[in-house]
């Protein structure tokens, strides 16, 4: 066949769906690769063709759209499964073509099984709630387009294995789950199951997400440098190892980039000739406040190094701070005889 623009396997779109549930999958060409939509393509005389390669096979084959009860169908740029089977797993290709134009992309589809508590290999989206912040809601995700607005589905919410009922601060409200006051104890996996009828059959959509309760913006502060501080002096003799930790606390801030860096005499360590290594470690509190520690290390410090200015800097969306470390050269203890002589005023 003639040349076709092949966008390859779009592994960014690793689609995972549950066994025995409906799935609607849009052809990624129109979402990520082409500058026009399906309607434009269709009215220009282009045809959308679907085919697939089964798991652990190399052979591309057409999708069977003549299965009982139209189990697999295509509607515009959407491939429908009503419902999926485990062996639908494979790489799916959508190809847009006419006699003069061709473009195609493949994407992996994985049909997964869940256990009785909704655990599965599915990668879960994470929804962050602010601690003690007032009413916050999560919404049952990715259920648009499965049923018309005239259909009233039933929605059951679970936390882990258990239906959410009589919880003090979590209230199911249809497609939404309301947290009156989010607490650390609300951390966990939440599942909504949407049940709806279609053509005399009942379908279920299961969606699980992870809720993580994080620090509230009400309590957020600029970075706090715990070390270096005014109470600790780094007193070294030439030839010793100099180790200065910079420990900074960052309040949790949604989408904030937390940065810590050292300057030596106003320059980044990379820009100066001395042999400096910097090791960073990061720890998080239960509400995702962050503590970053950067340890500046000079293996064999010189008297020149001990005269330099060592400043720890930190920056977040809340502001920027800096703190200099107190570094000085240790004065060698005078020899005993000299000290005595001086003490007795000898000349």
């Amino acid at each position: 066949s003639e040349r076709c623009d092949d966008w390859g396997l779009d592994t960014m779109r690793q689609i995972q769906v549950f066994e025995d549930e409906p799935a609607r999958i849009k052809c990624p060409l129109f979402e990520h690769f082409l500058k026009f939509n399906y309607s434009t393509a269709h009215s220009a005389g282009l045809t959308l063709i679907w085919y697939w390669t089964r798991q652990d096979r190399d052979l591309e084959e057409p999708i069977n759209f003549r299965l009982p009860e139209n189990r697999i169908s295509k509607e515009k740029d959407v491939l429908w499964f009503r419902p999926t089977l485990l062996n639908d797993t494979g790489n799916y290709t959508c190809m847009l073509r006419n006699t003069t134009y061709c473009s195609k992309v493949a994407f992996p589809l994985e049909v997964v099984q869940k256990d009785s508590c909704f655990n599965s290999p599915m990668k879960l989206p994470v929804h962050k709630l602010y601690i003690e912040y007032g009413i916050q809601r999560i919404t049952c995700p990715n259920v648009d387009g499965y049923f018309p607005s005239s259909v009233k589905p039933t929605i059951t919410w679970y936390m882990g294995c258990y239906k959410i009922q009589n919880f003090n601060n979590v209230i199911p409200e249809g497609m939404n789950l309301s947290f009156l006051i989010a607490l650390i104890s609300n951390n966990g996996n939440y599942t909504c199951v949407v049940t709806y009828p279609e053509n005399g059959r009942t379908f279920h959509l299961t969606r699980t997400l992870t809720v993580k309760v994080v620090g509230s913006p009400k309590n957020a502060v600029p970075p706090v440098i715990h070390s270096p501080n005014d109470h600790v002096v780094y007193e070294k003799e030439p030839g010793e190892e100099l180790l200065i930790p910079c420990t900074v606390y960052f309040s949790f801030l949604m989408d904030s980039r937390n940065e810590v860096w050292w300057t030596i005499d106003g320059k980044k360590p990379d820009d100066i000739t001395i042999d400096v290594t910097i090791n960073e470690s990061i720890s998080h509190s239960r509400t995702e406040d962050e503590t970053r520690t950067q340890i500046l290390s000079i293996k064999k410090v010189t008297s020149e190094d001990l005269k330099r200015s060592y400043v720890c800097h930190a920056r977040s969306a809340k502001g920027e701070v800096a703190k200099a470390a107190k570094v000085k050269q240790k004065v060698p203890a005078p020899r005993y005889t000299v000290e005595l002589a001086c003490g007795f005023g000898a000349t």
């Epitope: 066994e19 025995d20 099984q113 869940k114 256990d115 009785s116 508590c117 039933t154 009589n166 009942t202």
Partner: antibody, heavy 117, light 107 residues
């Protein structure tokens, strides 16, 4: 379409055991709960327990705990209910009922178990 | 266990009548209530799940309502094929429990 086909009627002696099968088709057997419900002659419905074939998780009604065993064979999409130490009051029609969640969406045709000496 | 009390235990109504069956739980069940229909000599069939959700293929003359401990099944216009026993069932807390049933007959 979903179909649950149960094994045939059984006549059992008191103190013995009975094992009723329920063969499922038309849905993903591993991904739904299989419930067992019984109905004594002229009486109402009584839930006995359920199993999730995907991971073997079971829940039993306290009344039947220790006397009933639910199992599932994923390779044949068949669920089993075994009731031991039978007594005359266990005479009933035993139903399997499939439910993706907790409601029992589809039921088998029922198996009559008669316990008589 | 949660007790489910259904009333009436039986009723007789004419074709076209509006029929109401009630079910009371011994404690709140948060709308986790199903209704089943069982015709003589047959297995039960799910009619309504989660208080008011019509199961696929069930005629729209059947409807459910209620909250807390009190729930209702309504047949808006009784048809001859509706002759059956109707059971409510709670699925709020294990073990699932059924009401005693309501036998519906045609006058």
């Amino acid at each position: 379409q979903v179909q649950l086909v149960q094994s045939g009627a059984e006549v059992k002696k008191p103190g013995s055991s009975v094992k009723v099968s329920c063969k499922a088709s038309g849905y993903a057997f591993s991904s739904s709960w299989m419930n067992w419900v019984r109905q004594a002659p002229g009486q109402g419905l009584e839930w006995m327990g359920r199993i999730y074939p995907g991971d073997g998780n079971t829940h039993y009604a306290q009344k039947f705990q220790g006397r009933v065993t639910l199992t599932a064979d994923k390779s044949t999409s068949t669920a089993y209910m075994e009731l031991s130490s039978l007594r005359s009051e266990d005479t009933a029609v035993y139903y399997c009922g499939e439910g993706y969640l907790d409601p029992m969406d589809y039921w088998g045709q029922g198996t009559l178990v008669t316990v008589s000496s | 266990d949660i007790q489910m009390t259904q009333s009436p235990s039986s009723l007789s109504a004419s074709v076209g009548d509006r029929v109401t069956i009630t079910c009371q739980a011994s404690q709140g069940i948060n709308n986790y209530l199903n209704w089943y229909q069982q015709k003589p000599g047959k297995a039960p069939k799910l009619l309504i799940h989660y208080t008011s959700g019509l199961h696929a293929g069930v005629p729209s003359r059947f409807s459910g309502s209620g909250s807390g401990t009190d729930y209702t099944l309504t047949i808006s216009s009784l048809e001859p094929e509706d002759v059956a026993t109707y059971y409510c069932q709670q699925y709020s807390i294990l073990p699932w429990t059924f009401g005693g049933g309501t036998k519906v007959e045609i006058k």
